[in-house]
């Protein structure tokens, strides 16, 4: 997150970190069910661990943390590169979470976002770009949903209805390492960090997010079919 600020503790209990050994964060994710996470399809890896209820990036033990293995990864069947449409994936945890103030799911919004909607994006991704500088604790950033026209103007021929753009002033954006993390609007999960320009936070180059309102049926049906 570029030019965000430290999230208040306990305010993002659905935020998950996907880790490679040894404790290397490579993507964010979101708890949407007691045993299921949502993340970006481009975050797919064969072997990884999941950390929930953790505030700092470092692997130091925190009393609220819960650790899991991802036992099943189900990318959306329509995910395609290089277009990056349908950039979402469900991850089944090896057991159900224990609900606490630090770990609980968030509902996926069934309403598509309108331009001007105020949202919050969070993650442990780099706070500088192209330099790499990872934060000590989870970062939060207020962003506003842009109209689909502004989104398409920023990225001609690259945007479809499975994506939406959001940003704030130049110099504020999600960035590398935030992928798969949540965009929360009006208390519901509206999007996932998908992609953006490089370096991050360039003027007139907003972040692009997976438009989850288009996928509520797929999410529900996939969880039911694999539970």
């Amino acid at each position: 997150i570029i030019n965000g600020s430290d999230c208040d503790m306990h305010t993002q209990p659905w935020q998950a970190a996907l880790l490679l050994r040894p404790n290397q964060l490579y993507c964010g994710a979101v708890l949407v069910h007691p045993q299921w996470l949502l993340t970006a399809a481009h975050c797919r890896k064969k072997v990884f661990r999941v950390r929930l209820g953790h505030y700092s990036l470092s692997p130091v033990y925190e009393s609220g943390q819960q650790m899991f293995q991802g036992v099943k990864s189900i990318p959306h069947p329509g995910y395609s590169h290089p277009g990056h449409s349908n950039d979402l994936m469900l991850i089944k945890l090896n057991r159900r979470i224990r609900p606490t103030k630090d770990v609980r799911p968030i509902n996926v919004s069934s309403h598509c976002p309108s331009a001007g909607t105020k949202c919050l994006v969070s993650g442990w991704g780099t706070t500088k770009s192209p330099q790499v500088h990872f934060p000590k604790v989870l970062q939060c950033l207020n962003i506003s949903v842009l109209s689909q026209k502004r989104c398409e103007d920023a990225y001609p021929r690259q945007i479809d209805d499975t994506m939406f753009c959001a940003g704030d002033k130049a110099g504020r954006d999600s960035c590398q390492g935030d992928s798969g993390g949540p965009v929360v609007c009006n208390g519901s999960l509206q999007g996932l960090v998908s992609w953006g320009d490089y370096p991050c936070a360039r003027p007139n180059r907003p972040g692009v997010y997976t438009n989850l309102c288009k996928f509520t049926k797929w999410i529900q049906e996939t969880i039911q079919a694999n539970s």
């Epitope: 590169h81 290089p82 277009g83 192209p130 992928s179």
Partner: antibody, heavy 127, light 108 residues
Framework: QLQLQESGPGLVKPSETLSLTCTVS??????????WVWIRQPPGKGLEWIGS???????YYSPSLKSRVTISVDTSKNQFSLKLSSVTAADTAVYYC???????????????????WGQGTTVTVSS | DIQMTQSPSSLSASVGDRVTITCRAS??????LNWYQQKPGKAPKLLIY???SLQSGVPSRFSGSGSGTDFTLTISSLQPEDFATYYC??????????FGGGTKVEIK
Amino acid sequence: QLQLQESGPGLVKPSETLSLTCTVSGGSISSDDYYWVWIRQPPGKGLEWIGSIDYYASTYYSPSLKSRVTISVDTSKNQFSLKLSSVTAADTAVYYCARGRPLGYGAKHYYYGMDVWGQGTTVTVSS
Amino acid sequence: DIQMTQSPSSLSASVGDRVTITCRASQSISSYLNWYQQKPGKAPKLLIYSASSLQSGVPSRFSGSGSGTDFTLTISSLQPEDFATYYCQQSPYFPPLTFGGGTKVEIK
């Protein structure tokens, strides 16, 4: 201003291992989120990608060379290197190192263009 | 593997001419295409990235367009220093990164 400089032997015998180093000056190889790339160009021919290594030390190799190639980074020396084993005359080429600038973040981070190049070093494979 | 086909392989043009070089990918690569210029005995130089974005320091007479499988590099008014070989390059999610065969722009 970032500069890249290739170094290594100009002559390698068939079946031996070609070893080249790229020294990065004017910037830190470990501070920025770039790819570090090796490319070669046989005499009178076009450009051929050999492989790349990223900020996280993940390597990506050309399938046609994968069994013979190793790319590594030495952050303490601000260098990255290429090893190509079991060389033949077909490996004779100008070898370039380059920096790969990602075209985006997230899903776009795997795509890049080479925005800074070394001047190239000629390697001849001959007995 | 994605194949990149450049055309023509060579062309002759005069100073001031408008020159167009095309590059075709064997499957869609969205806008992930870059263009390079290479002069004899020198390393390639990045001109255009992401199909249409001009690399810093490159003259505005160079422009790129296209998306999907068909791409174009245009030099609006050829200058003496533009006589060189031009390569397109795609950078895929999975290797290999591949270049086109090159287009040599010669003096008529």
